[in-house]
Interface confidence: low
């Protein structure tokens, strides 16, 4: 068996740090056997078998010119092996951040804080931290650790599924390369990192007969759980074309009737979502949807929903029948919602 410990990385490659002494190990001989060392492609002997260093080659203060392939051979000239030297640096603590698009799962991403120049991998795990008692500031021993499964496609991301909203988690991301390992610990509370995805399916429709009204409707983001214990609240912004400033309202449900639109002008509308108890932050804005208030009077045919007015709107009178209020139903998939046991 080889006298050389195999560092993590491609086989046949050994590693060192610039400016430091580097030892290369001849893989195909017995430990302590005297060998000769050559630089691949160059006949000059780097170190003879009488060096007293056995199967190792010592390069003092290695620099980039020492990188490359080396050949070691036994006393009788047989090839002991080829070794490629690659120089780089030990890992530094990675930069880690976590985010959640719903209240049951969160993901963490990382990036190196310094480039090591060496093959690098990351070990990712997490522990759940629980408080012992209501008044106690002490924490029980952490439960776990459990692996934080990494994206299979090699993206620097891992996902914790089935997280508990009220728990705190300690994320461990360890950068590993052949010269060592370095760990970053990050304490994460789902409440603080929650940022829903933007609402989906935003539609903006005119309200026939009401030249200053627009009806906007949308749905929950697909990433929000189908049977949510936590609802979302919404923020809607709208503005006429060419107007720089947005008007903002906080709708009560999944639609909103804008009553102060500018007649005849297209309007941009966008919506954002947030946990209804203000955990985390607002989502990014949805893609803008556009709509233009209706013009003209209502036709005399049987009125469709939302077309109940028989005269065009200027300023609605107090007793004029308004279109139905937007539904307060928080989620289209909650019609038969029962808490699971």
């Amino acid at each position: 068996s080889s006298p050389c410990p195999q560092a993590w990385g491609p086989p046949g490659v050994q590693y060192g740090q610039p400016g430091r002494s580097v030892k290369l190990c001849c893989p195909g001989v017995t430990a302590g056997d005297p060998v000769s060392w050559f630089r691949d492609g160059e006949p000059k002997l780097l170190q003879g078998p009488d060096s007293g260093l056995g199967h190792e080659l010592v390069l003092a203060q290695a620099d980039s010119t020492d990188e490359g392939t080396y050949i070691c051979q036994t006393l009788d000239g047989a090839l002991g092996g080829t070794v490629t030297l690659q120089l780089g640096y030990p890992p530094a603590r990675p930069v880690v951040s976590c985010q959640a698009a719903d209240y049951e799962n969160f993901s963490c991403t990382w990036s190196p804080s310094q480039i090591s120049g060496l093959p690098t991998r990351y070990l990712t795990s997490y522990r759940k931290k629980t408080v012992l008692g209501a008044d106690s500031q002490r924490r029980s021993p952490s439960t776990g650790p459990w692996p934080c499964p990494q994206d299979p496609l090699g993206a620097a991301r891992c996902v914790v599924h089935g997280a508990e909203f009220w728990s705190q988690y300690r994320i461990n991301v360890t950068e590993v390369n052949p010269l060592g390992a370095s760990t970053r610990l990050l304490d994460v509370s789902l409440q603080s990192i929650l940022r829903p995805d933007p609402p989906q399916g935003l539609r903006v429709e005119s309200v026939p007969g009401y030249p200053r009204r627009l009806r906007a409707s949308w749905t929950y983001p697909a990433s929000w759980p189908c049977q949510p214990h936590f609802l979302l609240k919404f923020r809607l912004q709208y503005r006429p074309a060419q107007h720089p400033a947005w008007s903002t309202v906080e709708p009560a449900g999944l639609e909103e009737v804008i009553t102060d639109a500018v007649a005849g002008l297209p309007h941009a509308v966008r919506v954002s979502a947030r946990d209804f108890l203000d955990a985390g932050t607002w989502s990014t804005w949805s893609p803008e949807a556009w709509g233009t208030p209706s013009t003209g009077t209502i036709p005399k045919e049987i009125p469709a929903w939302g077309q109940l007015h028989t005269q065009p709107e200027v300023e609605p009178q107090v007793d004029s029948p308004a279109p139905p209020r937007p539904s307060l139903q928080p989620h289209p998939r909650l019609l038969d919602h029962r808490d699971s046991v």
Epitope: D40, G41, T69, L79, T82
Partner: antibody, heavy 117, light 107 residues
Framework: QVQLVQSGAEVKKPGASVKVSCKAS????????MHWLRQRPGQGLEWIGN????????HYNQKFKDRVTMTVDKSTSTAYMELSSLRSEDTAVYYC??????????WGQGTLVTVSS | DIVLTQSPATLSLSPGERATLSCRAS??????LHWYQQKSGQAPRLLIK???QSISGIPARFSGSGSGTDFTLTISSLETEDFAVYFC?????????FGQGTKLEIK
Amino acid sequence: QVQLVQSGAEVKKPGASVKVSCKASGYTFTNYWMHWLRQRPGQGLEWIGNIGPSDSKTHYNQKFKDRVTMTVDKSTSTAYMELSSLRSEDTAVYYCARGDYVLFTYWGQGTLVTVSS
Amino acid sequence: DIVLTQSPATLSLSPGERATLSCRASQSISNNLHWYQQKSGQAPRLLIKYASQSISGIPARFSGSGSGTDFTLTISSLETEDFAVYFCQQSYSWPLTFGQGTKLEIK
């Protein structure tokens, strides 16, 4: 000393195939990549591809990808390059070259392949 | 593919003079550039690797410099046996490509 000895000159008709061999000696065959290159009359050098003799992993120049096959016979320390669907523009001296992954340190003497109807 | 352009195409100098050959890459290739010498009827010979690293057995009068897109091969004092064709080669991306060559001839 390192030696790469290539097969002799070939004359082929358009549409035919040619297989050039390169017998290596003087070093451990399975420790080095073998590259194939060509040089058309009075022209520059063109890299065709390479093969790792220990694992036979290849990298081909896309220009030749559909027409070239590189193989090795470790038992005889010989590398082979076959080029199919020959055309007159393939008339060239073909070289094998021992090197690392991307460099060409030792070269064969070259094999002239003439494609003519 | 990365294109390497060598200049001049032909360089006429006398023995003892200094020769400067240029190679320009169509995109930045860091230092992944190598120089070869080819004498008439012979296979090429590696002179310089990775822009400036010398090769064992190559006379010290051969040196290389450059990084990014512009590279230079310098022969400090020409010997008779240096009159040949010189090629640059890049190893930044597949396929490996060569310049069209500079012919160094006796004036």
